[in-house]
Amino acid sequence: NKILVKQSPMLVAYDNAVNLSCKYSYNLFSREFRASLHKGLDSAVEVCVVYGNYSQQLQVYSKTGFNCDGKLGNESVTFYLQNLYVNQTDIYFCKIEVMYPPPYLDNEKSNGTIIHVKGKHLCPSPLFPGPSKP
């Protein structure tokens, strides 16, 4: 039995930051779980891990240098990413593993979310106005 995951097909990070919500067909309340976010078609880069184990507080970390935070809903984990770079535009996949109570459960691979990181563009300065006519 696999958990189903729903994600937005695409998100745009305008200010180098984005919130990605992973919605599960499973209630995480009072469960020990490991939710993670992976980058790339092959999910090769583990961007962020959110670990929950009954306590009210989530443990959040990244082994790959991403600035992330997480928020837990009954059937969702929202990943907050900051300081993203344009070259980190990619497809991102949510993953969930429930360790306790048995049985161990994980998810069917989702369709993923394309995160498009927009560079910061400076507004062009207005042209210097010429001398006013008398």
């Epitope: 443990q59 600035n67 997480g70 900051q82 300081n83």
Partner: antibody, heavy 120, light 107 residues
Framework: EVQLVESGGGLVQPGGSLRLSCAAS????????MHWVRQAPGKGLVWVSR????????SFADSVRGRFTISRDNAKNTLSLQMNSLRAEDTAVYYC?????????????WGQGTLVTVSS | EIVLTQSPATLSLSPGERATLSCRAS??????LAWYQQKPGQAPRLLIF???NRATGIPARFSGSGSGTDFTLTISSLEPEDFAVYYC?????????FGQGTKVEIK
């Protein structure tokens, strides 16, 4: 005026436990992420842990993960660091610092620090 | 994690002189770099954030510049109270990391 005042430091044996506290005043405590940063005698600054503004998530440096826990009481404007299984290398001055919730690791105010000495 | 290397380790100068401190990152941190001042027995104090923005109450003689991997803190004319240790810190990548410090001492 923003004030952060740490307490709870002292001498503890290896393997022992200690709980540090940080009392905050002069700002809306619940709007800020809070951090612990330490400094071993004569050494540089090392980030230890953080907690988000509502206390629902936390992160730890690899060197302390599994041994330290962080918590906050927004009603009492206090931050705590529970340190277990202490080692000699945990000897340091521990500072609490605040960071705006929009720029999580930008430490704009620091406390004066509390010294933790782990020795037998 | 990102390693920040500060140079020189010690800078010996006289009051009124210009101080130039360097911080180099092992990979790009964009402009997510801060500078702190620490005096003996005191807590660090934020001087500059996001590479070039002065923190509240910091005198104009302190300025920061740079982006990517190379950053500079400049003190245009040293005052007696500026002799201290200066640390850079990045918040681009997790975990946040600090440089090892540059001590500015009286010549």
């Amino acid at each position: 005026e923003v004030q952060l005042v740490e307490s709870g430091g002292g001498l503890v044996q290896p393997g022992g436990s200690l709980r540090l506290s940080c009392a905050a005043s002069g700002f809306t405590f619940s709007s800020y992420w809070m951090h612990w940063v330490r400094q071993a005698p004569g050494k540089g600054l090392v980030w230890v842990s953080r907690i988000n503004n509502d206390g629902s998530s936390a992160s730890f440096a690899d060197s302390v993960r599994g041994r330290f826990t962080i918590s906050r009481d927004n009603a009492k404007n206090t931050l705590s660091l529970q340190m277990n299984s202490l080692r000699a290398e945990d000897t340091a001055v521990y500072y609490c610092a605040r960071a705006d919730s929009s720029s999580w690791y930008h430490f704009d105010y620091w406390g004066q620090g509390t010294l933790v000495t782990v020795s037998s | 994690e990102i390693v920040l290397t500060q140079s020189p380790a010690t800078l010996s100068l006289s009051p009124g002189e210009r101080a130039t401190l360097s911080c180099r990152a092992s990979q790009s941190v964009s402009s997510y770099l801060a500078w702190y001042q620490q005096k003996p027995g005191q807590a660090p104090r934020l001087l500059i954030f996001d590479a070039s923005n002065r923190a509240t109450g910091i005198p104009a003689r302190f300025s920061g510049s740079g982006s990517g991997t190379d950053f500079t803190l400049t003190i245009s004319s040293l005052e007696p109270e500026d002799f201290a240790v200066y640390y850079c810190q990045q918040r681009s990548n997790w975990p946040p990391t600090f440089g090892q410090g540059t001590k500015v001492e009286i010549k």
